[in-house]
Interface confidence: medium
């Protein structure tokens, strides 16, 4: 689910540039209790990468994942 739970860890930094979209399989938001809002992308290798939800490329990836 793209929605966060209270057990979700927080992000304290963001990736600075896009990873190839084809290698990202899902995403979720970190908890609203975190000091920094963040989207966590999950790669096909199940690695989690924090991203800034204000960035255009992040929003585009979310839209793409929602449609797939």
């Amino acid at each position: 689910s793209p929605y966060s739970s209270d057990t979700t860890p927080c992000c304290f930094a963001y990736i600075a540039r896009p990873l190839p979209r084809a290698h990202i399989k899902e995403y979720f938001y970190t908890s609203g209790k975190c000091s920094n809002p963040a989207v966590v992308f999950v790669t096909r290798k199940n690695r989690q990468v924090c991203a800034n939800p204000e960035k255009k490329w992040v929003r585009e990836y979310i839209n793409s994942l929602e449609m797939s």
Partner: antibody, heavy 129, light 111 residues
Framework: QVQLVQSGAEVKKPGSSVKVSCKIS????????LSWVRQAPGQGLEWMGA????????SYAQRFQGRLTITADDSLNTLYMELGSLRSDDTAMYYC??????????????????????WGRGTMVTVSS | QSVLTQPPSVSGAPGQRVTISCTGS?????????VHWYQQLPGTAPKLLIY???NRPSGVPDRFSGSTSGTSASLAIRGLQSEDEADYYC???????????FGGGTKLTVL
């Protein structure tokens, strides 16, 4: 401090190919992408491409598509750049550089700076007939 | 022709303040991608000087500062010293080219 140690200078004929290596002292890690950047004599920096172990893929600048191959050998902790169909305007210093890409949830005490934060000393490739 | 535009050269006397501009477009700086600055001393590899628009890696003096606005970025160097004489490059990610792009470089001369 991680070091990127590059192979020695090369002199090549037009039409041939060159393979340059870059040994990563701390090993190849999912946390970093590894790029190749070149600089022709008296000119600026030009990004060529990168390998991204985190997602097991390689990306290339459009102008090098088809004649550039970037590979990494985890067992040797070494990055390679092979450029084919060499022309005289490929004469340049070729640098390997690393870039942090894995920024996971949780503490960031080990996080380094964004951008290309560690560079090799460069390998001069001269293409001449 | 570089994707990011920098002045070819700037100069200043010791102790002075100089700025180097870097102009991009809507597919890179204007798209919110962070700008990084690199210093290249004569005969050496580039070194990361400023990352994430305005942050200094450890060991970089606070005489160096960076900022961005719109589709442009700038590097400021105050209290100019002779050892600052070098080439300076801005770099960022470009969405259209899908890769790192750099400015053409600015040669700083300390008079």
């Amino acid at each position: 401090q991680v070091q990127l140690v590059q192979s020695g200078a090369e002199v090549k004929k037009p039409g041939s190919s060159v393979k340059v290596s870059c040994k990563i002292s701390g090993g190849i890690s999912d946390n970093y992408a590894l790029s190749w950047v070149r600089q022709a004599p008296g000119q600026g920096l030009e990004w060529m491409g990168a390998v991204i172990p985190l997602v097991e893929t390689t990306s290339y600048a459009q102008r090098f598509q088809g004649r550039l191959t970037i590979t990494a050998d985890d067992s040797l902790n070494t990055l390679y750049m092979e450029l084919g169909s060499l022309r005289s305007d490929d004469t340049a210093m070729y640098y390997c550089a690393r870039e942090q890409v894995a920024v996971g949830p949780g503490p960031t005490s080990n996080r380094g700076p964004d951008g290309l934060d560690v560079w090799g000393r460069g390998t001069m490739v001269t293409v001449s007939s | 022709q570089s994707v990011l535009t920098q002045p070819p050269s700037v100069s200043g006397a010791p102790g002075q303040r100089v700025t180097i501009s870097c102009t991009g477009s809507s597919s890179n700086i204007g798209d919110g991608y962070d700008v990084h600055w690199y210093q290249q001393l004569p005969g050496t590899a580039p070194k990361l000087l400023i990352y994430g628009n305005s942050n200094r890696p450890s060991g970089v003096p606070d005489r160096f500062s960076g900022s961005t606005s719109g589709t442009s970025a700038s590097l400021a160097i105050r209290g100019l010293q002779s050892e600052d004489e070098a080439d300076y490059y801005c770099g960022t990610w470009d969405d259209i080219l899908n890769g790192w792009v750099f400015g053409g470089g600015t040669k700083l001369t300390v008079l």
